[in-house]
Interface confidence: low
C-alpha cells in the first residue's frame, strides 16, 4: 500500500461511511441482529485528556491491537452468519465489506508504520496497560463499535501519524 | 553516545542564502526527527522548523515560511537547513537538536544539541 | 499561536531553593520541557515531561505542572547553576514548538 495513501482523508471517510451504513442497516432488524455469543471487542471511548498526555506509542498500540481485535470479531461474526439461518442474507454483505475494509485498513497502517511505533521503544509496551475492551453479542453493536473506532482512536492516530510525516 | 556536529561559522550579505549542515552520529539517524532552533544576540530560543528524516516532511514556523527549507540526507546521516533572503536581524547562533522518543509528538523533547553556528549578516 | 511567560530574572541566595514559573493557557494539557543554557553554550535538556530527569541531571532539578504554570525547582542551589532556563511545549494545534522567553537565574554572592 502506499505509505501516505490513509493520510488523505476521503480513504477514511469511505471505510468510516460503509462501517455507518452498516449500522444503520443492522439497528433495523429484530434485537439488533443477535450474534448468539459475546464476541470481545475494543472499547472505543477517548478520554481526549488522556490520550493527549499519553505516548504516541501508546496510541499507536490502541490502535494496531483494537484493529486486530475488531478484525478477529469481524471474522467470528462472518463465520457465526455463515452458519445462521435466521439472520438475512444482505447482512453478509455488509460484514464482508467490513472484513475487507479491516484488511485494508489494516496493510494501509502497517505502510505507515504504526505495528513498528507500537512496540518500539521496548518501556512504551511494559508500561501500557492492557487494551480495554468491551462485548457485542449484536450485529448492530459491533458495526456501532467498528464506525466508533474508526471516527475516533483510528482518526486520532492517522491525523497525528499524518500531520508529522511519520511513516 | 550521540553527537551532533554543525558546521563551521559563515558572514554573508544581505539578500543571500545561507545552508547549516548536522551531521548526526551515535544512534539510528532515521529514527528521530531534527529540529533547528535560532538564537539572535541576547536573546531567547526561537524554534525554526524541523524534519523527520524517515519520510522527508519537514515543518516550518510560520514566521520562517517561504524563507527557510530543511533537508536530510539519510546516506550521510546529515540535516541541512538553509536560510533565504538573509537581513541583518537573522544574525544569530543556529543550533540543530534531535528529537527523542516520538519525533513531532507531545511526547518528543529535545534531547541532544549540536553546538551552534554563528552566522552573521552583515553588508 | 501558543504563549509560554516566564519571568525575565529570578535570584537566589547559595543554598536556598529557586523557583522558575512558565505559564500558559490550560498549560497541564502539555507537557512541559526544561532546558539551562550557559553563556556561550548550547541548551542542555534538564527536566522533560512536566517531571522527569534526564540521566546526569541532579536530583535537585525538579518540575510540576499544575493549574496554569509549570514550574522548574532546584533545591540547594550552587553558583554553577547560574544560567537561562526555558520551558518548551509541543502546541499539537499548530504542531509546533514553541518557547517560553527564558528566565535568567542569578546566584547572589
Known amino acids: 500500500a502506499p505509505a501516505r495513501l490513509i493520510c488523505d482523508s476521503r480513504v477514511l471517510e469511505r471505510y468510516i461511511l460503509e462501517a455507518k451504513e452498516a449500522e444503520n442497516v443492522t439497528m433495523g432488524c429484530a434485537e439488533g441482529c443477535s450474534l448468539g455469543e459475546n464476541i470481545t471487542v475494543p472499547d472505543t471511548k477517548v478520554n481526549f485528556h488522556h490520550w493527549k498526555k499519553s505516548e504516541a506509542g501508546r496510541h499507536a498500540v490502541e490502535v494496531w491491537q483494537g484493529l486486530a481485535l475488531l478484525s478477529e470479531a469481524m471474522l467470528r461474526s462472518q463465520a457465526l452468519l455463515a452458519n445462521s439461518s435466521q439472520l438475512p442474507e444482505t447482512l453478509q454483505v455488509h460484514v464482508d465489506k467490513a472484513v475487507s475494509g479491516l484488511r485494508s485498513l489494516t496493510s494501509l497502517l502497517r505502510a505507515l508504520g504504526v505495528q513498528k511505533e507500537a512496540v518500539s521503544p521496548p518501556e512504551a509496551a511494559s508500561s501500557a496497560a492492557p487494551l480495554r475492551t468491551v462485548a457485542a453479542d449484536t450485529l448492530c453493536k459491533l458495526f456501532r463499535i467498528y464506525s466508533n473506532f474508526l471516527r475516533g482512536k483510528l482518526k486520532l492516530y492517522t491525523g497525528e501519524a499524518c500531520r508529522r510525516g511519520d511513516r | 553516545q550521540v553527537q551532533l556536529v554543525q558546521s563551521g561559522a559563515e558572514v554573508k550579505k544581505p539578500g543571500s542564502s545561507v545552508k547549516v549542515s548536522c551531521k548526526a552520529s551515535?544512534?539510528?539517524?532515521?529514527?528521530?526527527?531534527i529540529s533547528w532552533v535560532r538564537q539572535a544576540p541576547g536573546q531567547g530560543l526561537e524554534w525554526m522548523g524541523g524534519?523527520?528524516?524517515?519520510?522527508?516532511?519537514?515543518d516550518y514556523a510560520q514566521k520562517f515560511q517561504g524563507r527557510v527549507t530543511i533537508t536530510a540526507d539519510e546516506s550521510t546521516s546529515t540535516a541541512y537547513m538553509e536560510l533565504s533572503s538573509l537581513r541583518s536581524e537573522d544574525t544569530a547562533v543556529y543550533y540543530c537538536?534531535?528529537?527523542?522518543?516520538?519525533?513531532?509528538?507531545?511526547?518528543?523533547?529535545?534531547?541532544?544539541w549540536g553546538r551552534g553556528t554563528l552566522v552573521t549578516v552583515s553588508s | 499561536s501558543y504563549v509560554l511567560t516566564q519571568p525575565p530574572s529570578v535570584s537566589v541566595a547559595p543554598g536556598k531553593t529557586a523557583r522558575i514559573t512558565c505559564s500558559g493557557d490550560?498549560?497541564?494539557?502539555?507537557?512541559v520541557h526544561w532546558y539551562q543554557q550557559k553563556p556561550g553554550q548550547a541548551p542542555v535538556l534538564v527536566i522533560y515531561?512536566?517531571?522527569e530527569r534526564p540521566s546526569g541531571i541532579p536530583e535537585r532539578f525538579s518540575g510540576s505542572n499544575s493549574g496554569n504554570t509549570a514550574t522548574l525547582t532546584i533545591s540547594r542551589v550552587e553558583a554553577g547553576d547560574e544560567a537561562d532556563y526555558y520551558c518548551?511545549?509541543?502546541?499539537?494545534?499548530?504542531?509546533?514548538?514553541?518557547f517560553g522567553g527564558g528566565t535568567k537565574l542569578t546566584v547572589l554572592g
Open positions: 518548551q511545549v509541543f502546541d499539537e494545534s499548530s504542531w509546533h514548538w514553541v
Open positions: 490550560n498549560i497541564p494539557e502539555y507537557y
Open positions: 537538536a534531535r528529537e527523542l522518543y516520538y519525533p513531532g509528538t507531545w511526547m518528543a523533547v529535545m534531547a541532544y
Open positions: 515531561r512536566d517531571n
Open positions: 551515535g544512534g539510528t539517524f532515521r529514527s528521530y526527527a
Open positions: 524534519i523527520d528524516p524517515i519520510s522527508g516532511f519537514a
